[in-house]
């Protein structure tokens, strides 16, 4: 392992998974590294092997239990270390005392569906996946709609500042194909970030009735 510029970032999905990314410029692709988790008040230790995801980036998931089990709480601290093999010994490359509920990134919302579609509007609902009951209603969402001829990056963001698992899109164009995505973020945690975007949901508005203004 070479001493290039390195970065170690981990997030807790609020239930039973800690996902980590380790990046290091100049590191050899075949360097063997792992993440070791040592909780302060639990009986388990966990290790996962860092696997390459790009030229200088490795990732792994610490799976702490069944997907919907609540394995950590707001008072837990898990010491996370990146260990890389150097000859016959392991070297600590990064260490952090990880507070799970300060470093949240939830799973992407799932089960997107069109509840009702008209010529100019569409009502869409979704569900959150593997989210802790601790949040109660303290979640927010961002949504975006892909219009024809545009990119996702150009799509304006719609913010839902409460736990609302539906949206009514308005001022749509009749008989037009759209795509919709949503992501979620807990309000808690200094280093908490948005979930990945959901899988896009494709829908088409109804055509305008013949002889009527649009």
């Amino acid at each position: 392992a070479v001493n290039g510029t390195s970065q170690f970032t981990c997030f807790y999905n609020s239930r039973a998974n800690i996902s980590c990314v380790w990046s290091q410029d100049g590191a050899l692709q075949d360097t063997s590294c792992q993440v070791h988790a040592w909780p302060d008040r639990r009986r388990w230790n966990q290790t996962c092997e860092l696997l390459p995801v790009s030229q200088a980036s490795w990732a792994c998931n610490l799976i702490l239990g069944a997907p919907d089990s609540q394995k950590l709480t707001t008072v837990d601290i898990v010491t996370l270390r990146v260990l890389c093999r150097e000859g016959v010994r392991w070297r600590v490359m990064a260490i952090q005392d990880f507070k799970p509920f300060e470093n949240l990134r939830l799973m992407a919302p799932i089960s997107l569906q069109v509840v009702h579609v008209e010529t100019h509007r569409c009502n869409i609902s979704w569900e959150i996946s593997q989210a802790s009951h601790y949040f109660e209603r303290h979640l927010e969402f961002e949504a975006r709609t892909l219009s024809p001829g545009h990119t996702w990056e150009e799509a304006p963001l719609l913010t839902l500042k409460q736990k609302q698992e539906w949206i009514c899109l308005e001022t749509l164009t009749p008989d037009t194909q759209y795509e919709f995505q949503v992501r979620v973020k807990p309000l808690q945690g200094e280093f908490t970030t948005w979930s990945p975007w959901s899988q896009p949901l494709a829908f088409r508005t109804k055509p305008a009735a013949l002889g009527k203004d649009t």
Partner: nanobody, 126 residues
Framework: QVQLVESGGGLVQPGGSLRLSCAAS????????MSWVRQAPGKGLEWVSS????????YYADSVKGRFTISRDNDKNTLYLQMNSLKPEDTAVYYC???????????????????RGQGIQVTVSS
């Protein structure tokens, strides 16, 4: 804004002890790795010791290993450096420093230092 205020320095004889303190404010203290660095007269900044956010990982420069102990009290937002068996070469201005995240990188101990205090003078002389 981040504030780090060191105290506890002074003049001490070789072989003596001092305990430095650093009162932190303006950020969530327990979320960040912290360190002590020092600057001897006419020299550059030298890393001394680091500690992770909950104090579960501690690291030391070879020059102070076995003599200095870093610790923290997250309830009091305070970082400490207990210095024993002091030597004349420990004479320096000591700075309390905050890293830019909760992560500390042992191979590059000074990397990521984002803020530091005004410093406190420690003089070891007979």
């Amino acid at each position: 804004q981040v504030q780090l205020v060191e105290s506890g320095g002074g003049l001490v004889q070789p072989g003596g002890s001092l305990r430095l303190s650093c009162a932190a404010s303006g950020f969530t203290f327990s979320n960040y790795a912290m360190s002590w660095v020092r600057q001897a007269p006419g020299k550059g900044l030298e890393w001394v010791s680091s500690i992770t956010g909950a104090g579960r990982g501690t690291y030391y420069a070879d020059s102070v290993k076995g003599r200095f102990t870093i610790s923290r009290d997250n309830d009091k937002n305070t970082l400490y450096l207990q210095m024993n068996s002091l030597k004349p070469e420990d004479t320096a201005v000591y700075y309390c420093a905050k890293y830019d995240s909760s992560t500390y990188y042992p191979p590059t101990p000074a990397r990521g230092i984002a803020d530091r205090g005004q410093g406190i003078q420690v003089t070891v002389s007979s």
